[in-house]
């Protein structure tokens, strides 16, 4: 699991690769702060609850965020 609270940032390693939006349990976007100077995106997968850190600068990940927000806006009344 690429997560650690012993460093200032949560993510140790990040991926440029997207995941299937339907496989996502939760997508957390943690803004940059005094503790971590960069935006962090943590995807929690439905299967086994595995957490993955995604690169917010990757175009493929931006496409994923777009797809997720589109899906959410469809669901909300």
């Amino acid at each position: 699991v690429p997560l650690s609270r012993t460093v200032r940032c949560t993510c140790i390693s990040i991926s440029n690769q997207p995941v299937n939006p339907r496989s996502l349990e939760k997508l957390e976007i943690i803004p940059a702060s005094q503790f971590c100077p960069r935006v962090e995106i943590i995807a929690t997968m439905k299967k086994k609850g595995e957490k993955r850190c995604l690169n917010p600068e990757s175009k493929a990940i931006k496409n994923l965020l777009k797809a997720v927000s589109k899906e959410r806006s469809k669901r909300s009344p």
Partner: antibody, heavy 119, light 107 residues
């Protein structure tokens, strides 16, 4: 040099199954997602979907759900595309293509595998 | 899904001519378009990405432009080796879409 080398041409009967391989070299296999593209004879390119090479999770385009299966063997840096219950309309050239995820376009392609379905 | 309408489907031009191919997206694709060249029996080859960025080793006679929904691919001076089919690809989306292709022939 970055290379994607696909398996050779296949001739199959309707109802059979075919499995195409795409072996990569020249880069770290798990750094980029792998996509599959179909080209029917005399037709254009059609995107089939992708597989996340870190997790092995496949995602299929709507027209390619059901009979298509994308898998990996990370130990040999190889991606596979399996197609079952073959029909004559599956006759096509199938390409694997590396997705440069940071910018998200396909930068390197395999040479293509011709699948012919004929009774 | 985003549709990409590519035109013309075929065109005939002479060596030295300026050739233009267009792709129109069904919605704004934010310049995320790539152009590929495919010769018979070969895999597509990336020429341009992000509307106008030329891949290393690609001759400068190839160029791209556009924004929003409308994009153009240009060959400033057609060479015999440019005979091929050209495709646009939109990648502003998790669901990738190709244009229908333009078959380029020499007059």
């Amino acid at each position: 040099e970055v290379q994607l080398v696909q398996s050779g041409a296949e001739v199959k009967k309707p109802g059979a199954t075919v499995k195409i391989s795409c072996k990569v070299s020249g880069y770290t296999f798990t750094d980029y997602s792998m996509h599959w593209v179909r080209q029917a004879p005399g037709k254009g390119l059609k995107w089939m979907g992708w597989i996340n090479t870190e997790t092995g999770e496949p995602t299929y385009a709507d027209d390619f759900k059901g009979r298509f299966t994308f898998t990996l063997d990370t130990s040999t840096s190889t991606a596979y595309m399996e197609l079952s219950s073959l029909r004559s309309e599956d006759t096509a050239v199938y390409y694997c293509a590396r997705n440069y995820d940071y910018d998200a376009y396909f930068d390197v392609w395999g040479q293509g595998t011709t699948v012919t379905v004929s009774s | 899904d985003i549709q990409m309408t590519q035109s013309p489907s075929s065109l005939s031009a002479s060596v030295g001519d300026r050739v233009t191919i267009t792709c129109k997206a069904s919605q704004d694709i934010n310049k995320y378009i790539a152009w590929y060249q495919q010769k018979p029996g070969k895999a597509p080859k990336l020429l341009i990405h992000y509307t106008s960025t030329l891949q290393p080793g690609i001759p400068s006679r190839f160029s791209g432009s556009g924004s929003g929904r409308d994009y153009t691919f240009t060959i400033s001076s057609l060479q015999p080796e440019d005979i091929a089919t050209y495709y646009c690809l939109q990648y502003d989306n998790l669901l990738f879409t190709f244009g229908q292709g333009t078959k380029l022939e020499i007059k």
